[in-house]
């Protein structure tokens, strides 16, 4: 498994409810990464042990986080996996999604896709302290 976590994790709000997360492959000996796992949740959900699990297949080191809710601070962690197993998670990165000044976001139709705000509880191969510890 990759010895280290993805590095250079950055999260940028690119639309009122969508963020771009980008990163670089783990440092160290050349390792072919086959999948990245992104864990993200609002700070409140994260502390409660509830987060969303997004797998980014393939080599492109970017992902879109969809259906974010204004007024929340989101916490993001990423790990890299290969055919041997999953490596450690990166330090957490925070993104504040500020409330909109207008109610425009309330007028939009519900997004009928995989971003239908489900959250999943679990330890995901990590203990509770590592999941809720904010770096």
């Amino acid at each position: 498994a990759p010895a280290g976590p993805p590095v250079g994790v950055k999260v940028t709000l690119i639309e009122d409810d969508t963020a771009l997360v980008s990163w670089k492959p783990p440092d160290g000996p050349e390792t072919v990464v086959t999948r990245y796992t992104i864990l993200y949740a609002s700070r409140k959900a994260w502390i409660a042990g509830e987060w969303q699990v997004l797998h980014r297949e393939g080599a492109i080191t970017m992902a879109l986080l969809e259906n974010l809710v204004a007024g929340n601070v989101y916490i993001v962690k990423i790990s890299a996996s290969n055919e041997v197993g999953e490596g450690p998670f990166s330090n957490s990165v925070e993104l504040a999604v500020l409330p909109k000044e207008t109610s425009e976001s309330n007028q939009r139709p519900k997004r009928l896709d995989s971003a239908d705000a489900k959250v999943y509880s679990g330890y995901y191969h990590l203990d509770q302290k590592s999941m809720t510890g904010i770096a």
Partner: nanobody, 119 residues
């Protein structure tokens, strides 16, 4: 296996138009929203917009007047129509889909198609 394959890129003159396609396979294409994003050489990724499975769209305000996103679910194909192209529209264009198995989400990006705007 989920696959997204973009096509239609190439060299186009300033002021010209281009239509990109993205063919999806390995998932229920008609069930999911689809995004277009682009990355100019040496620049950050820029979100263009997305289209719901119902066909309604949302665009990056700075690009809204220049692009139109559409889809044909019967052909499992996503489209991006670009008009009045400028040199700064030179970029690699990607389509993106996030698919769920009901428990986890799996995000897939196409390999990208390069659009070069130059005279």
């Amino acid at each position: 296996e989920v696959q997204l394959v973009e096509s239609g890129g190439g060299l186009v003159q300033p002021g010209g138009s281009l239509r990109l396609s993205c063919k999806g396979s390995g998932f229920n294409f008609g069930d999911y929203a689809m995004h277009w994003v682009r990355q100019a050489p040496g620049k950050a990724l820029e979100w263009i917009g997305y289209i719901y499975n119902t066909g309604s769209t949302k665009y990056n305000p700075s690009l809204k007047s220049l692009v139109t996103i559409s889809r044909d679910n019967s052909k499992n194909t996503l489209y991006l129509q670009m008009n009045s192209l400028r040199a700064e529209d030179t970029a690699t264009y990607y389509c993106v889909s996030t698919v769920t198995n009901g428990v986890e989400y799996f995000q897939h990006w196409g390999q990208g198609t390069l659009v070069t705007v130059s005279s």
